[in-house]
């Protein structure tokens, strides 16, 4: 029996992989900050957890994915106002009862140190300093990420 | 435990300066996340929001007494110190510092300390 | 004139369940700062009662309870007892970068 968080992300998930496979992206586009290989939307509006996540695929991205403790203190860097949290692509499976990114793939417990408790509803919030577990149904601000495509140089042969 | 508490004399004139020192233990300001503010409370009244220091030594001020406030803090010694300039009958009330902690909430007050201004 | 917005004054017999609503706009409460509630008794400093919307410190009994929607917030208290008389205040963040608190509500138990 899978919550309707979790559905939301397997449709989403699903529909994308549907899609024709798109050019990648070489440039950030206006609006979106450039971390890495990643492109980030930082919202001024506030949303629950489903709704930011739905509103990240209107953007043709996704809700923030980190990949370890490196990126997470990039990212935070970023947060300008210490008071602000944001939403990212973390939530709690209570199928498998761990945390789990929208992608499908679990969280290294090693990665993010997770103020709060690990149950039923609760999404992760980041702030400039932590990370937090926190009621899916709060309405806080949320970041996207689109990756970028990495520019190869083409070999061409001696004529 | 966590503790912090005011000090600073309890009356000054008006056009004076008033200095406050909040004395703290049972945390770091260097510590990523924490903080100190200052609230006062003049009497019988709502609380009013001052100051407020971070841990980066970022600082932020109430906009209506920005131009007469000044924080700053002393890791070493535990200390933050808070200086109102060109006091007021109006200033008049119980100064509070309080620890900034999870959540952004000031989770820890001092006991506060009146200060009167009066000629 | 305080930025976030509360009544005066409520009151209830004991036993009873009150709420105190904490008014702000889309840029505080409604911008996605979290709303922190204190307890002010009688000739003492205020005290954490509420964190984050609806958290609870240790030693803060199951009676509180914090909610928060759009640009409102409220707090609850179930079961009111005399020892709950106090003045209650909230507070939030602002997109200006500064701290706002209510103005604070006077809790009398009947």
């Known amino acids: 029996q899978k919550s309707s968080i979790e559905k939301c992300s397997v449709d989403i998930q699903q529909s994308r992989n549907k899609t024709t496979e798109r050019p990648g992206l070489l440039n950030c586009p206006i609006y979106w900050q450039q971390l890495r290989e990643k492109c980030l939307l930082f919202s001024h509006t506030v949303n629950p957890w489903n709704n930011s996540l739905a509103d990240c695929s209107t953007k043709e991205s996704s809700l923030l994915l980190i990949r370890d403790k490196d990126e997470l203190i990039h990212t935070q860097n970023l947060i300008r106002d210490k008071a602000i949290l944001f939403w990212i692509g973390l939530n709690f499976s209570l199928s498998e009862k761990n945390w789990k990114w929208i992608n499908g793939s679990f969280l290294n417990s090693n990665d993010l140190e997770i103020r709060g408790d690990a149950k039923e509803n609760s999404c992760i919030s980041i702030s400039q300093t932590s990370v937090y577990s926190e009621y899916c149904s709060t309405e806080i601000r949320w970041i996207c990420q689109k990756e970028l495509t990495p520019v190869r140089n083409k070999v061409y042969p001696d004529s | 435990q966590i503790t912090l508490k005011e000090s600073g004399p309890t009356l000054v004139k008006p056009t004076q300066t008033l200095t406050l020192t909040c004395t703290f233990s049972g945390f770091s300001l260097s510590t990523s996340g924490v903080g100190v503010g200052w609230i006062r409370q003049p009497p019988e009244k709502a609380l009013e929001w001052l100051a407020l220091?971070?841990?980066?030594?970022?600082?932020l001020y109430s906009p209506s007494l920005k131009s007469r406030l000044t924080i700053t803090k002393d890791t070493s010694k535990n200390q933050v110190v808070l200086t109102l300039t060109n006091m007021d009958p109006v200033d008049t009330a119980t100064y509070y510092c309080a620890r900034l902690g999870m959540r952004h909430a000031f989770d820890i007050w001092g006991q506060g300390t009146m200060v009167t201004v009066s000629s | 004139q305080s930025v976030l917005t509360q009544p005066p004054s409520v009151s209830g017999a004991p036993g009873q369940r009150v709420t105190i609503s904490c008014t702000g706009s889309?840029?505080?409460?409604?911008?996605?700062?979290?709303v922190h509630w204190f307890q002010q008794l009688p000739g003492t400093a205020p005290k954490l009662l509420i964190y984050?919307?609806?958290y609870r410190p240790s030693g803060v009994p199951d009676r509180f309870s914090g909610s928060k929607s759009g640009t409102s917030a409220s707090l609850a208290i179930a079961g009111l007892q005399a020892e709950d008389e106090a003045d209650y205040y909230c507070?939030?963040?602002?997109?200006?970068?500064?701290?706002?608190f209510g103005g604070g509500t006077k809790l009398t138990v009947l």
């Open positions: 507070q939030s963040y602002d997109s200006s970068l500064s701290v706002v």
């Open positions: 889309s840029s505080n409460i409604g911008a996605g700062y979290d």
């Open positions: 220091i971070y841990w980066d030594d970022d600082k």
């Open positions: 984050g919307n609806r």
